[in-house]
Interface confidence: low
């Protein structure tokens, strides 16, 4: 057989034989001549090996081109391919030869030594073993052992062929530790060597590329790309490295295994790419291809190499972030920067950290924005490199949705007097300020009330209050608007004529942040009626009385009630009047009834009130003749005690003589304190120049003279101690001598 | 970012019944006013209904005052329309929308009253 | 009820130029509770105006509301082509909601 390249001038140099298959016996000699254009060579079977010199080549004599291969004595390990070829190229050719050696129809060939077979467990894949026969037409069939298993040729995917060896599916020999082939020859049965089956892994399960996603460098900085593969045991592997630069002399690539971890089912192996100094044109994209034999996984990411650090805020930065009171407010800081930039938050000028209601960071988070965070915050990058600094204001508005403060205290329920005027407020403070505040009301008997809800009264439908029909007529007033506790509020008020409707009415404030209601109960009776004396708002620890008093000739069985939290059983969806139908859910008192002459006056008394006596008190009255109840609910507030203070300062005062001086003791304290005012630590009265008024608050000194100078001291005591202030009267000028001849 | 999302329309005949729903997100559903505006084929807006964000308070337009049932479930962040004795009338584009003034609104679902 | 009544139906102009939309109320509105909405085709309507004069948040400077009482405008300073679309106005000081018919604003 002539192998040559096509087109090529060169002929394949001529054998001495003609066949391409020789078949010679064991013993005799094998001599093959070669005649060709230019200098030859020959190759033979198992070259090199130690018995080389029996094979003898020589030249011919009669040509310049010719060589003699001669083999004396072969045996059956001489079997294989004879190539002629000329020097320094392909073209040649090849006679097979066949040696029968009936002793030993197996060729031994040196790579054989190992006796290895590697084997994946593929259900497609075939394995050579390669027991090569001496005899072209052999039976071999392949043993496999433990357990011990035969495989015959069958024609289809196992075969045996001289040249190769016993091919095999894989898979059918994967159990097995060891292989052999074995031939019959006259009844006589011979064996190769053996063959040691090592079933190799293929399988990668994943190939991951550190840093992953995108790299940024600056030029002349180093990079290493770490390319991790995770495969199955029993695995070879190949990497490759595809990169941008056609420069390999500044890369470095160290492939390594890496020690799996003990009872993992996965080896890993490890390819390190180094550039120790990145120029602009080692910028794009880099891709490790991991290769098993069988398998490849690939995974790439990009470098990008700048030419300098730089730092620069993202076009996406907002200026002004409106938030609401409650949320949790996010601002992200939105930066092209190489390498990544420190990055500081300032509020107000000042630096913050970290703690558990804001994070900084790539974000500035609060987690519950109040209204306090409101303001400027400066944000600043630096450039760890460059140390150069960008700087970012954003400012953050707290909008705040309505909040009606009287929604804060318990909601009242007291009842009205029919007949009488009344003003319900909404109190409102919102911000942004408000759009709009509005009123709604509902017929008592049209909605539902359910007591243990945090919004007891469901009305399906609300009135607007310019719709009175049927109800009270309304007036709403123009909105108010006043400074209390430091913020500016708007005060709604409505304006109920007349009572003589039971209704429901409901302030609605919104804003652009949301929105607020109250729903006021407005509860019309015409009957009894609650008083407490004294009048003034009780403080702890005092004595008070809460009077109910109806008209004898129309009411009896009359009943003092708290509602407390056993109130809470009172039956769903009941209309409003609940609290006379549920009576029994109540806690009822003990009163002392007194009657004049037209009125029963039931009376509940507190030697020693206290804070836990707060609460809805209910008077129960029966009408005479339907036996219809009649019910009435007051709150009390009961005021904590609290020792005196003075909440503000005395100035010093300077004045002339005959002027008039004003001076107030700014005073707190429950019990109401008892105001004393001292000159000079002597107890100060009143007489025709010296004027006290308002609880002894307010001292007034008219018409001053040179004596009336001196420390004034300011006392004000109550049971629970008291508290002194003082201050300095200064009076200029010279007294006048009175004649008063 | 402020999201109203309707469902529930279709074809219904002359008397039946749908139940629309309006699925809200990015906002403090339980702080706002919701209504329904509908808008018939080549027509203008018409306010249907409101209702109010706690206390469940609702209003409707006389056209459809016994006939159709506005209602929330604050926990669910959803509003729903339930219209009973549909009329050929009826049949529009219904918006669900958010506040006393609609400043966003859903991409509207098509109710058919048709036999 | 309300009724709201919207001048002209129909409103062709050119990019740039200016606009007026004018919508009269049946009875006295409060301008707390007066907005003005623009629809395009396919879309849902817009809040552009609300409590008479504020702009809703997004929406470009070159939108002014004004008027009080019974009569309300609604200014567009410079027509872009996407401006193209109809505009309502809606009042709800008083139940029932109600919106007027719309002024159909067409870019040459």
């Known amino acids: 057989a002539s192998v040559g390249l096509p087109g090529d001038s060169l002929h394949p140099p001529k054998l001495s034989t003609q066949k391409d298959i020789l078949t010679i016996l064991a013993n005799t000699t094998l001599q093959i001549t070669c005649r060709g254009q230019r200098d030859l060579d020959w190759l033979w079977p198992n070259t090199p090996r130690d018995s080389e010199e029996r094979v003898l080549v020589t030249e011919c004599g009669d040509s310049i081109f010719c060589k003699t291969l001669t083999v004396p004595r072969v045996v059956g390990n001489d079997t294989g391919a004879y190539k002629c070829f000329y020097r320094d190229t392909d073209v040649s050719s090849i006679v097979y030869v066949y040696v029968q050696d009936h002793r030993s129809p197996f060729i031994a060939s040196v790579s054989d030594e190992h006796g290895i077979v590697y084997i994946t467990e593929n259900k497609n894949k075939t394995v050579v073993i390669p027991c090569r026969g001496s005899i072209s037409n052999l039976n071999v069939s392949l043993c496999a052992r433990y357990p011990e298993k035969r495989f015959v040729p069958d024609g289809n995917r196992i075969s045996w062929d001289s040249e190769k060896g016993f091919t095999i599916p894989s898979y059918m020999i994967s159990y097995a530790g060891m292989v052999f082939c074995e031939a019959k020859i006259n009844d006589e049965t011979y064996q190769s060597i053996m063959y040691i089956v090592l079933v190799v892994g293929y399988r990668i399960y994943d190939v991951v590329l550190s840093p992953p996603h995108e790299i940024e460098l600056s030029a002349g900085e180093k990079l290493v790309l770490n390319c991790t593969a995770r495969t199955e045991l029993n695995v070879g592997l190949d990497f490759s490295w595809q990169f941008p630069s056609s420069k390999h002399q500044h890369k470095k690539i160290v492939n390594r295994d890496v020690k799996s971890l003990p009872g993992t089912v996965a080896k890993m192996f490890l390819s390190t790419l180094t550039i120790d100094s990145v120029t602009k044109s080692d910028q794009g994209e880099y891709t490790c291809t991991a290769y098993s034999g069988l398998m490849t996984k690939k995974n790439k990411t990009f470098v990008r190499v700048h030419t300098k650090p730089f730092i620069a805020f993202g076009s996406g930065m907002k200026s002004l972030v409106e938030a609401t009171v409650g949320s949790q407010v996010r601002i992200p800081v939105k930066y092209l920067s190489y390498p990544a930039p420190d990055i500081k938050w300032y509020r107000n000028g000042r630096p913050i950290e970290s703690n558990y209601t804001m994070i900084v960071g790539d974000e500035l988070t609060i987690m519950e924005v109040s209204e306090r965070d409101a303001g400027n915050y400066t944000v600043i990058l630096t450039n760890p490199i460059s140390m150069e600094k960008q700087s970012h204001m954003v400012s953050l508005v707290v909008n705040v949705p309505p909040q009606i403060g009287e929604k804060a205290l318990i909601s009242p329920m007291d009842s009205y007097q029919y007949g009488t005027m009344q003003t319900l407020t909404c109190t409102v403070y919102a911000n942004p300020p408000l759009h709009h505040i509005q009123w709604y009301w509902q017929l008592e008997e049209a909605c539902s009330y359910r007591p243990s809800q945090t919004n007891p009264y469901t009305c399906k439908e609300w009135r607007h209050v310019k719709d009175f029909q049927g109800g009270n007529k309304i007036e709403v007033t123009k909105n108010q608007y006043a400074l209390i506790e430091g913020k500016n509020k708007t005060v709604s008020t409505l304006v109920i004529q007349a009572a003589y409707v039971s209704a429901l009415y409901k302030c609605e404030a919104i804003n652009k942040a949301g929105r607020g209601e109250r729903v006021i109960s407005f509860h019309v009776i015409r009957g009894p009626e609650i008083t407490v004396q004294p009048a003034t708002q009780p403080t702890e620890r005092e004595s008070m009385s809460l009077l109910c008093t109806a008209d004898r000739n129309t009411f009896e069985n009359l009943t003092w009630y708290k509602l407390g939290s056993q109130a809470t059983s009172v039956h769903m969806g009941e209309s409003l009047t609940p609290v006379c139908k549920n009576l029994d859910a109540l806690w009822k008192l003990n009163g002392t009834v007194f009657s004049n002459s037209t009125n029963d006056i039931l009376i509940v008394a507190f030697q020693n009130a206290s804070l836990q006596d707060q609460g809805n008190y209910v008077c129960s009255a029966q009408d005479k003749k339907t036996k219809k109840r009649h019910c009435l609910v007051k709150q009390l507030v009961i005021l904590e005690r609290m020792a005196p203070m003075i909440t503000g300062n005395l100035e010093n005062q300077t004045t002339t003589i005959g002027e008039t001086i004003e001076v107030v003791c700014p005073t707190s304290g429950n019990p109401t304190p008892l105001i004393t005012w001292f000159k000079d630590n002597e107890t100060l009265v009143e007489d025709s120049g010296i004027v006290l008024k308002d609880g002894n608050r307010n001292l007034t000194i008219r018409r001053v003279r040179k004596e009336d100078g001196g420390l004034y001291t300011c006392q004000a005591c109550n049971v629970l101690g008291c508290a002194r202030a003082e201050t300095l009267f200064i009076i200029e000028g010279v007294q006048e001598k009175t004649n008063l001849e | 970012e402020v999201q109203l999302l309707e469902s529930g329309g279709g074809l219904v005949q002359p008397g039946g019944s749908l139940r629309l729903s309006c699925a809200a997100s990015?906002?403090?559903?339980?702080?706002?006013?919701m209504g329904w505006v509908r808008q018939a084929p080549g027509k203008g807006l018409e306010w249907v209904s409101s209702i109010y964000p706690q206390g469940g308070a609702t209003s409707y337009a006389d056209s459809v005052k016994g006939r159709f049932t506005i209602s929330r479930d604050n926990s669910k962040n959803t509003l729903y329309l339930q219209m009973n004795s549909l009329r050929a009338e009826d049949t529009a584009v219904y918006y669900c929308?958010?506040?006393?003034?609609?400043?966003?609104w859903g991409q509207g679902t098509l109710v058919t009253v048709s036999s | 009820d309300i009724q709201m009544t919207q001048s002209p139906g129909t409103l062709s102009l050119s990019p740039g130029e200016g606009a007026t939309l004018s919508c009269r109320a049946s009875?006295?509105?409060?301008?707390?509770?007066f907005g003005w909405y623009q629809q395009k085709p396919g879309q849902a309507p817009r809040l552009l105006i609300y409590g008479a004069s504020s702009r809703a948040t997004g929406i470009p400077d070159r939108f002014s509301g004004s008027g009080s009482g019974t009569d309300f405008t609604l200014t567009i300073s410079r027509l872009e082509p996407e401006d193209s679309a109809v505009y309502y106005c809606?009042?709800?000081?008083?139940?029932?909601?109600?919106f007027g018919g719309g002024t159909k604003v067409e870019i040459k």
């Open positions: 009875q006295s509105v409060s301008s707390n509770y």
């Open positions: 990015g906002f403090t559903f339980s702080w706002y006013v």
């Open positions: 929308a958010r506040g006393n003034y609609f400043d966003y």
């Open positions: 809606q009042q709800f000081d008083s139940l029932p909601l109600t």
